[in-house]
């Protein structure tokens, strides 16, 4: 596949696919009944538009962009999704007390369009 296309956002700063952090409590996430700690999570997620060839992950994403321009009602634009993840450890409730559990796909590390 060709090299990933550039990181210049034609829509203006902060409008295109990027990593965004949202502070969320266990209650916000609906986790309060099974997670004990941390009580607050800095959730990193991928948000923003995928115009032109912006951060196209692969050739398929480039094709999708081109076809979306031609047939916007039929072919959706590429979506902004995590390219990789940061792991996170939670202290959670168990039948016998508490335990640690590692989740390796919980937090986005970086983003691309696919």
């Amino acid at each position: 596949a060709r090299a990933r296309n550039g990181d210049h956002c034609p829509l203006g700063p902060g409008r295109c696919c990027r990593l965004h952090t949202v502070r969320a409590s266990l209650e916000d996430l609906g986790w309060a009944d099974w997670v004990l700690s941390p009580r607050e999570v800095q959730v990193t997620m991928c948000i923003g538009a995928c115009p032109s060839q912006f951060r196209a992950a692969n050739m398929h994403a480039q094709i999708k962009t081109s076809l979306h321009r031609l047939k916007p009602d039929t072919v959706p634009a590429p979506c902004c999704v995590p390219a990789s993840y940061n792991p996170m450890v939670l202290i959670q409730k168990t039948d016998t007390g508490v335990s640690l559990r590692t989740y390796d796909d919980l937090l986005a590390k970086d983003c691309h369009c696919i």
């Epitope: 941390p38 009580r39 792991p87 996170m88 450890v89 390796d104």
Partner: antibody, heavy 119, light 110 residues
Framework: EVQLVQSGAEVKKPGESLKISCKGS????????IGWVRQMPGKGLEWMGV????????IYSPSFQGQVTISADKSISTAYLQWSSLKASDTAMYYC????????????WGQGTLVTVSS | QSVLTQPPSVSGAPGQRVTISCSGS????????VNWYQQLPGTAPKLLIY???NRPSGVPDRFSGSKSGTSASLAITGLQAEDEADYYC??????????FGGGTKLTVLG
């Protein structure tokens, strides 16, 4: 500046009790977990357990479950490691360490407390 | 016996490149991340690399980490006398216990 300052070296006899401390400063103490790590003389690092100072939830390595107690007093930003009956094999350097934001690594370490147990 | 296997020692001359390996299994390194710590003689460990290949601020870019399959590596380029230390890898096992490698003593020759 983030700092973890541990209590001083201890020399004890087998069967005695001991409580060592780790005081955190330069950050919100209740926002980060604290772990304890043992290093026996000339040996590697062994994870003992973790505490969430906010809710005082503790989890122990199976190797240390029932052998030690980890606690914290958030009002004075201090975590503790204690033994009710020391053995000669408890002779080691003990480190407290702060967990990074995602709980997956130790980003700051105390200077260590050397515990010597000898009759 | 450590869950993660490291060579007991490695050595290199100043300016050289050395690598330290850390071998695990499909229940730890294979599916999770690896962190590396440096322990200079007589001091506490210090975080060197986290999440396979990230350097905390203040760590020189001579230090780099990588992971492939069930193994990880720490590379040190432009070796300096002050790099002489013990190096430990760390990950988790299947029950989310934190596990360390046995440690590798790096000797800078000459």
């Amino acid at each position: 500046e983030v700092q973890l300052v541990q209590s001083g070296a201890e020399v004890k006899k087998p069967g005695e009790s001991l409580k060592i401390s780790c005081k955190g400063s330069g950050y919100s103490f209740t926002s980060y977990w604290i772990g304890w790590v043992r290093q026996m003389p000339g040996k590697g690092l062994e994870w003992m357990g973790v505490i969430d100072p906010d809710g005082s939830y503790t989890i122990y390595s199976p190797s240390f479950q029932g052998q030690v107690t980890i606690s914290a007093d958030k009002s004075i930003s201090t975590a503790y490691l204690q033994w009710s009956s020391l053995k000669a094999s408890d002779t080691a350097m003990y480190y407290c360490a702060r967990y990074g934001r995602y709980g997956t690594y130790f980003d700051y370490w105390g200077q260590g407390t050397l515990v010597t147990v000898s009759s | 016996q450590s869950v993660l296997t490291q060579p007991p020692s490695v050595s290199g001359a100043p300016g050289q490149r050395v690598t330290i390996s850390c071998s695990g299994s499909s229940s730890n390194i294979g599916v999770l991340y690896v962190n590396w710590y440096q322990q200079l003689p007589g001091t506490a460990p210090k975080l060197l690399i986290y999440s396979n290949d990230n350097r905390p601020s203040g760590v020189p870019d001579r230090f780099s980490g990588s992971k492939s399959g069930t193994s990880a590596s720490l590379a040190i380029t432009g070796l300096q006398a002050e790099d002489e230390a013990d190096y430990y890898c760390q990950s988790w096992d299947s029950s989310s216990n934190y596990v360390f490698g046995g440690g590798t003593k790096l000797t800078v020759l000459g």
